[in-house]
């Protein structure tokens, strides 16, 4: 007779990252007898949902069940059927969502009300939408990747399971960069947090953890790029703006209506006697390094010492991942290597931004030209974000590993999220007996 | 004042369908949600599923889903609830209720009268 | 789903005397949480939503309070006309779900 194999005890869990450009799907995967270990959970599935962030169908939301339904039904698939009525769903959506709440709460609800409407259709235990507050995005992110990575194991390794990993239980800070907002986490060492706001206290498997995080809003690479359009159009002569942060020869009509629609663009609006203006690009990397710089107010700090828009930060300690768009722009640069020095990654930028846009296009042929031609706005962006905003150093340039996925899971809030919301995560060291589900973050 | 105004009782064989409707008369419509809720004789209330008329959109509970339909038809601020393969079980009350609002105000600020579905043979 | 879990199933309470509901919710529901009152032959008609802020026209001897999971309906002093059942609902989660019901009758 031939051996059945035994069903694999295993427990599936999906979260939908509803970001300001778009959305994606996570499925993760974790053996259900080890739910309390720490680095079980993986991901098995990501799914990019086609089209726009979901704060863009305020006025068509019925279009919302079509544009969920190809990655739903993937998460279909893949999970078994026998486990689909056990498999919690949860969305949580972002600065995108955030951004439209502050300009009406009632069309922000009625987005997500919709949203909510299609998930409870499939056959899992949907969990609700909500919109996460700038300070959760930034600590399930360092979660995640503090949890990927074994630092909340204290089983003691002699070999590694990443490469940038160090072997010790220090924990990674987190630098997450969306399209409308953008997240600094870590561990400050023996400082005090100077703004309770930014202040974040966790007991995770038995050891505590006093925590800075910071969401800046509208300093997402897409949002700091409408902040910079709108300030620059402010001071020229015409509807033309040459802008050094996009190649020579590049030309885009830009809506004067679309460049005020963001909440983001509102201290710098001005009446303009034209509706429409044309960037012309130049393509100089200092110059655009300039610009962005003058996005950042470092003029005033009522704390020891300030990011920048009176944004308390601590002295930088230890190693962080740059994850989300940090690592998506710095690996189509071709920039993340641990070898590339912060000179090096300025030089490069130089060149690149000083390319002709006819010359990209060719050399790039299979990018949308809508995300090509923003490469060196983004780039210069990051780089501007890190070194002035944050006070990287090129020392300590070498302490940023741009990660996209560590354990082939991709590093970001989501996971970090499900963890908590699943109780994944206990307060106290699991015994080799499961605790009972009490104790959690 | 806005009511909702709801069809008259029916008396159904095992294994039809029965489509009861709802007229909104005296205000709005299309923007507000409309679910419908049963009520077994004796027994408490069951929550069935829900449209926005406006938007078209649709949800059921999952006991229901594949044998309830609702649609709305805004032009005659109408909302529809069908039940198909009818059994015995499927005698109750039904109601239709507006819903507050959108997200998380999904409770029911106003209701139909109620219709009578008997199933029997 | 939320399974909603309503205690006791039945009150009997004299006119004029406090009447205290409960309404237990299986997960976390926040504030999301109405009370409605039915009585025979009728259609339910809201009381309190958001767990406790009352509806229009919804005299003031109605109270709702809690958050989370557990959840209590106060009537201060019971006129005869509040002899009725009383049902609660979550509104945090599809699908919407409903307790069994609290009947409160006369002592």
């Known amino acids: 007779t031939q051996n059945k194999a035994l069903p694999e005890n295993v427990k599936y869990g999906i979260v939908l990252d509803a970001g300001s450009s778009h959305t994606s799907l996570y499925i993760y995967k974790w053996p259900a007898e080890k739910e309390n270990d720490t680095g079980v959970v993986h991901q098995v599935e990501e799914c990019r949902v086609k089209g726009p962030g979901i704060s863009k169908f305020v006025q068509k939301v019925n279009e919302i069940g079509i544009y969920l339904t190809d990655c739903m039904e993937r998460a279909r698939e893949v999970i078994p059927r026998s486990q689909h009525q056990e498999t919690p769903v949860y969305l949580g959506a972002t600065a995108g969502m955030r951004l439209l709440r502050m300009e009406s709460e009632e069309l922000a609800d009625r987005v997500l009300d919709v949203v909510e409407r299609s998930l409870s259709n499939y056959p899992f235990d949907f969990q609700g939408a909500r919109i996460i507050t700038g300070q959760e995005e930034g600590a399930y992110g360092w979660i995640t990747i503090n949890y990927l990575l074994g630092k909340f194991s204290q089983k003691t390794r002699w070999f590694s399971i990443v490469p940038y990993e160090t072997n010790n239980q220090e924990t990674f800070g987190a630098l997450d960069l969306g399209g409308a907002s953008t997240q600094v986490t870590f561990v400050p060492q023996n400082q005090t947090i100077e703004s309770p706001d930014n202040a974040l206290q966790f007991r995770l498997y038995g050891k505590d953890y006093n925590v800075y995080t910071h969401s800046f809003l509208c300093y997402g690479k897409d949002q700091a790029l409408w902040q910079k359009l709108a300030k620059d159009i402010q001071v020229a002569s015409n509807e033309i703006l040459r802008d050094p942060c996009f190649h020579p020869g590049y030309k885009k009509v830009v809506n004067v209506s679309d460049l005020y629609k963001t909440p983001c663009t509102k201290r710098f609006e001005m009446t303009l006697p034209f509706q429409q203006f044309e960037i012309q690009g130049i393509g100089n990397y200092q110059q655009c390094h300039q610009s962005i710089l003058e996005l950042f107010n470092t003029s005033y700090c009522p704390y020891s010492q300030c990011a920048f828009n009176g944004i308390f930060l601590p002295p930088l300690q230890g190693d962080f991942g740059a994850f989300s768009a940090f690592y998506f722009v710095m690996k189509f640069l071709n920039l993340t290597s641990e070898k590339v020095s912060q000179e090096k990654v300025t030089e490069m930028m130089k060149k690149f931004c000083a390319q002709p846009w006819e010359e990209i296009k060719t050399s790039y042929a299979g990018v949308k030209e809508k995300y090509l031609s923003e490469y060196c706005f983004s780039g210069t962006y990051i780089l501007s974000l890190l070194l002035q905003g944050y006070h990287f150093t090129a020392d300590s340039w070498e302490h940023i590993h741009f990660i996209g996925k560590i354990q082939g899971s991709d590093a970001g809030w989501t996971l970090g999220y499900m963890l908590n919301l699943t109780n994944m995560i206990p307060a106290e060291q699991p015994l080799s007996t499961p605790l009972s589900h009490s104790t959690y973050v | 004042q806005v009511q909702l105004v709801q069809s008259g009782a029916e008396v159904k064989k095992p294994g039809s369908s029965v489509k009861v409707s709802c007229k909104a008369s005296?205000?709005?419509?299309?923007?507000?949600?409309i679910s419908w809720v049963r009520q077994a004789p004796g027994q408490g209330l069951e929550w069935m599923g829900s449209?926005?008329?406006?938007?078209?959109?649709?949800n059921y509970a999952q006991k229901f889903q594949g044998r309830v339909t609702i649609t709305a038809d805004e032009s005659t601020s109408t909302a529809y609830m069908e039940l198909s393969s009818l059994r015995s079980e499927d005698t109750a009350v039904y109601y239709c209720?507006?819903?507050?609002?959108?997200?998380?105000?999904?409770?029911?600020?106003?209701w139909g009268r109620g219709t009578l579905v008997t199933v029997s043979s | 789903e939320i399974v909603m879990t309503q205690s006791p199933a039945t009150l009997s309470v004299s006119p004029g005397e406090r009447a205290t509901l409960s309404c237990r919710a299986s997960q976390s529901v926040s504030s999301n949480l109405a009370w409605y009152q039915q009585k025979p032959g009728q259609a339910p008609r809201l009381l309190i939503y958001g767990a406790s802020t009352r509806a229009t026209g919804i005299p003031a001897r109605f109270s709702g309070s809690g958050s989370g999971t557990e959840f209590t309906l106060t009537i201060s002093s019971l006129q005869s006309e509040d002899f009725a059942v009383y049902y609660c609902q979550q509104h945090a989660l599809w699908p919407l779900t409903f307790g069994g019901g609290t009947k409160v009758e006369i002592k």
């Open positions: 449209i926005i008329p406006i938007f078209g959109t649709a």
């Open positions: 209720a507006r819903e507050a609002g959108y997200y998380r105000y999904r409770y029911f600020d106003l």
């Open positions: 005296g205000g709005t419509f299309s923007s507000y949600a």
